[in-house]
C-alpha cells in the first residue's frame, strides 16, 4: 500500500491548527470497516490518533487531534492538530493497514513570529558624544531561536561588543535580548534585526540617539510606529512606554488603554492599583514593569474583531498619549485542488480546477500559473467568505482547455504575513482519473 506524505516539513504557527497530510490509494470495493489507521510519534511511538473497526477511536494526544471522517473513504488519512505548541514539533508517522499496509513519516516544524523589537538605552538621559551607551534590543515570544543582526544608520554591520541571550519560557517560546555597547558620536542610528530562520520573517527596530534629551519630568509616551501583527488565537503585546520622572511612584500613575475610535475603555491603572480589564477579561498590564515606565498591554487570545487602533494615555503630573495599531492575521491552509470532471480526461476537454484554502485573515491574494510559471489570468473566479470568527475561506476556480499534459498551480498569499500557500495539479495526456488511482 502506498502511503504518501509531503516531503517538506509542515510549518505551523504556534496557536494555530496544522494539517499533517497523509493519503493512500484505496483498492476497489474498499470500505471503512476494513481500515486501520494509526498516527503516532515517530521516535517514541506514542499513539496520537487512530481509526479502527470502522470507527474513529479519537485522540490520544491531549484531545487536540482530529481526522477528516468524510474524506477517509477517498484515501485521505490526514490529521488535524489543533492549537499547535512548540512541544508538538517533530516527526509523526501515518500507518495505514487495510489488507496491504504501509507507513510514512511527516515532519512538523513549529514556528512563532518574533515581536517588533523594543529598544532601551542605558543611560537614557543627558547623553553626550563620547559617552558609552548600552542599547538593548528585546523581541519576544518567537520560535525557533532567532538570528540577531545589528547595523548602523548607513547599513554597516556592527558585530563587536554584541551579547545576545535567548531564554525559552514555559511554552518553549524564546525571548531574545541582544545588547550592543557603543561609544556615541555626535548622533547616530542603531538598528537591530531579529530574524526567524524558519518563517524567514524579519522584525526590526532602530533608535536614533541625539545628545540632547527631553527635559527630566516630561512624559513622552512612545509606541511602535508599525502595526503590531498578531496571529488569531495567540497573545499580542501592545507596547507603550513613558519616561518616569525622578521620585515617580505608581501611586501617581494614571494609565488608560482604550479603543482609539470609540473611546471604549480597555484597561486602566489608577489610584495605585490595576483596575483590571474592561475588555472581555482578555487584557493585562505588566505590573512589575510599570514603575520603569512600561505601560504595555497584553491582549490574550486575539480575535479578528480586535483589529484596530488602541490608545495608551498616561497621566502623572504631565500627560501624553499615543495610538498603536493592531493588525490581526491568520495563515491560510495549504490549498486543496479538485477537478470537475475528474475522470477519463482527454486533451481538448474543458476542465474546472478549484483551489480552496481555509481560515485565513485578512483576505487573500490568489494567483494561478502553468507549469512554466506563466500567469493564468483569464477565466478565473475567486470568492472569499468570512466565517463567524471573521476568518476567510477562499475558493478560486480556473476553467482551462486541457493540452497534451499540463501542470496548474494555485498560490494563496496572505498579504500581511507575506505567507504563500501553494497547491498544484498535473494532468497528463493519456486518459486519466483524478486523484490518480494506484
Amino acid at each position: 500500500l502506498e502511503v504518501q506524505v509531503p516531503e517538506d516539513p509542515v510549518v505551523a504557527l504556534v496557536g494555530t491548527d496544522a494539517t499533517l497530510c497523509c493519503s493512500f490509494s484505496p483498492e476497489p470495493g474498499f470500505s471503512l470497516a476494513q481500515l486501520n489507521l494509526i498516527w503516532q510519534l515517530t521516535d517514541t511511538k506514542q499513539l496520537v490518533h487512530s481509526f479502527a473497526e470502522g470507527q474513529d477511536q479519537g485522540s490520544a494526544y491531549a484531545n487536540r487531534t482530529a481526522l477528516f471522517p468524510d474524506l477517509l473513504a477517498q484515501g485521505n488519512a490526514s490529521l488535524r492538530l489543533q492549537r499547535v505548541r512548540v512541544a508538538d514539533e517533530g516527526s509523526f508517522t501515518c500507518f495505514v493497514s487495510i489488507r496491504d499496509f504501509g507507513s510514512a513519516a511527516v515532519s512538523l516544524q513549529v514556528a512563532a513570529p518574533y515581536s517588533k523589537p523594543s529598544m532601551t538605552l542605558e543611560p537614557n538621559k543627558d547623553l553626550r558624544p563620547g559617552d558609552t551607551v548600552t542599547i538593548t534590543c528585546s523581541s519576544y515570544q518567537g520560535y525557533p531561536e532567532a538570528e540577531v543582526f545589528w547595523q548602523d544608520g548607513q547599513g554597516v554591520p556592527l558585530t563587536g561588543n554584541v551579547t545576545t541571550s535567548q531564554m525559552a519560557n514555559e511554552q518553549g517560546l524564546f525571548d531574545v535580548h541582544s545588547i550592543l555597547r557603543v561609544v556615541l558620536g555626535a548622533n547616530g542610528t542603531y538598528s537591530c534585526l531579529v530574524r526567524n530562520p524558519v518563517l524567514q520573517q524579519d522584525a526590526h527596530s532602530s533608535v536614533t540617539i541625539t545628545p540632547q534629551r527631553s527635559p527630566t519630568g516630561a512624559v513622552e509616551v512612545q509606541v511602535p510606529e508599525d502595526p503590531v501583527v498578531a496571529l488569531v488565537g495567540t497573545d499580542a503585546t501592545l507596547r507603550c512606554s513613558f519616561s518616569p520622572e525622578p521620585g515617580f511612584s505608581l501611586a501617581q500613575l494614571n494609565l488608560i488603554w482604550q479603543l482609539t475610535d470609540t473611546k471604549q475603555l480597555v484597561h486602566s491603572f489608577t489610584e495605585g492599583r490595576d483596575q483590571g480589564s474592561a475588555y472581555a477579561n482578555r487584557t493585562a498590564l505588566f505590573p512589575d514593569l510599570l514603575a520603569q515606565g512600561n505601560a504595555s498591554l497584553r491582549l490574550q487570545r486575539v480575535r479578528v474583531a480586535d483589529e484596530g487602533s488602541f490608545t495608551c494615555f498616561v497621566s502623572i503630573r504631565d500627560f501624553g498619549s499615543a495610538a498603536v495599531s493592531l493588525q490581526v492575521a491568520a495563515p491560510y491552509s495549504k490549498p486543496s485542488m479538485t477537478l470537475e470532471p475528474n475522470k477519463d480526461l482527454r486533451p481538448g476537454d474543458t476542465v474546472t480546477i478549484t483551489c480552496s484554502s481555509y481560515r485565513g485573515y485578512p483576505e487573500a491574494e490568489v494567483f494561478w500559473q502553468d507549469g512554466q510559471g506563466v500567469p493564468l489570468t483569464g477565466n478565473v473566479t475567486t470568492s472569499q467568505m468570512a466565517n463567524e470568527q471573521g476568518l476567510f475561506d477562499v475558493h478560486s476556480v480556473l476553467r482551462v482547455v486541457l493540452g497534451a499534459n499540463g501542470t496548474y498551480s494555485c498560490l494563496v498569499r496572505n498579504p500581511v504575513l507575506q505567507q504563500d500557500a501553494h497547491g498544484s495539479v498535473t494532468i497528463t495526456g493519456q486518459p486519466m482519473t483524478f486523484p490518480p488511482e494506484a
Partner: antibody
Framework: EVQLLESGGGLVQPGGSLRLSCAAS????????MHWVRQAPGKGLEWVSA????????YYADSVKGRFTISRDNSKNTLYLQMNSLRAEDTAVYYC???????????WGQGTLVTVSS | QSVLTQPPSASGTPGQRVTISCSGG????????VNWYQQLPGTAPKLLIY???KRPSGVPDRFSGSKSGTSASLAISGLRSEDEADYYC???????????FGGGTKLTVL
C-alpha cells in the same frame, strides 16, 4: 514663586479670532501638562483643552474641537490658545492651569475675559 | 449639562459638618480619581483635594474627600464663614478623552 499669567482676552465679533497667551514662571515649564479652563459669566467651570509637556499630545473638548488650537513654546515658557470661528457661547473667563497628579490642576492663573458679541 | 452631577447648593451653620456629593459614571469617576476645587467669590479656583482624598499642603484637615463606585463626596467639618464658596468636582473621562467638571455647588454658611 509659581505663577501663571494670562493675556490676550478682549472683545471680538462672532466669527472672529483671538489668541490667548499664558506666561509661566517659577517652575520647569516643559515638564508639566497644561490646560485651558473657562467659566462663562455666572456659570460653572468647563475644561477646554490640554497639551502635554513636550507638546506632542493635545486634547480638546467637543465644544471647541476644530475651532481652537492649543500650543506651547517651551523655550519661552508660554502656553497659547488660538481661538477661531468664535461664537457668543465662547464668552467666558479663560484660565490657564498647570496639570497635576491624578488628572488634577494645582496652579491657576487669574484668568482673562473673552467677550464675543456684535 | 455637566458630565458630573453636583447639587447646585448646600448650606450649614458655623461648626457644623456638610457634605457635597458628585455623581458620575463608569468612564469617569468609576475608573478614575476625583479632584475637588474651591472658588471663593471673585477669585480663581484653588485645588482643595486631589486623588480622591489627598490634601495639598496648606489645605486644612477640616476638608476631606472620599470615593465609592461612581460617586465621590467632599466633607467639610467645623464649618467657618470663610468656607462660603463654590465647590467643583473634577475627573478624567476616558470615553471623552478629556477632563470633566461637575456643575458646581454653592455653599452658604448661615
Amino acid at each position: 514663586e509659581v505663577q501663571l499669567l494670562e493675556s490676550g482676552g478682549g472683545l471680538v465679533q462672532p466669527g472672529g479670532s483671538l489668541r490667548l497667551s499664558c506666561a509661566a514662571s517659577g517652575f520647569t515649564f516643559s515638564t508639566y501638562g497644561m490646560h485651558w479652563v473657562r467659566q462663562a459669566p455666572g456659570k460653572g467651570l468647563e475644561w477646554v483643552s490640554a497639551i502635554s509637556g513636550s507638546g506632542g499630545s493635545t486634547y480638546y473638548a467637543d465644544s471647541v474641537k476644530g475651532r481652537f488650537t492649543i500650543s506651547r513654546d517651551n523655550s519661552k515658557n508660554t502656553l497659547y490658545l488660538q481661538m477661531n470661528s468664535l461664537r457668543a457661547e465662547d464668552t467666558a473667563v479663560y484660565y490657564c492651569t498647570r496639570g497635576y497628579y491624578y488628572y488634577g490642576m494645582d496652579v491657576w492663573g487669574q484668568g482673562t475675559l473673552v467677550t464675543v458679541s456684535s | 449639562q455637566s458630565v458630573l452631577t453636583q447639587p447646585p447648593s448646600a448650606s450649614g451653620t458655623p461648626g457644623q459638618r456638610v457634605t457635597i456629593s458628585c455623581s458620575g459614571g463608569s468612564s469617569n469617576i468609576g475608573s478614575n480619581p476625583v479632584n475637588w476645587y474651591q472658588q471663593l467669590p471673585g477669585t480663581a479656583p484653588k485645588l482643595l483635594i486631589y486623588g480622591n482624598s489627598k490634601r495639598p499642603s496648606g489645605v486644612p484637615d477640616r476638608f476631606s474627600g472620599s470615593k465609592s463606585g461612581t460617586s465621590a463626596s467632599l466633607a467639610i467639618s467645623g464649618l467657618r464663614s470663610e468656607d462660603e464658596a463654590d465647590y467643583y468636582c473634577q475627573s478624567y473621562d476616558s470615553s471623552l478623552s478629556g477632563w470633566v467638571f461637575g456643575g458646581g455647588t454653592k455653599l452658604t454658611v448661615l
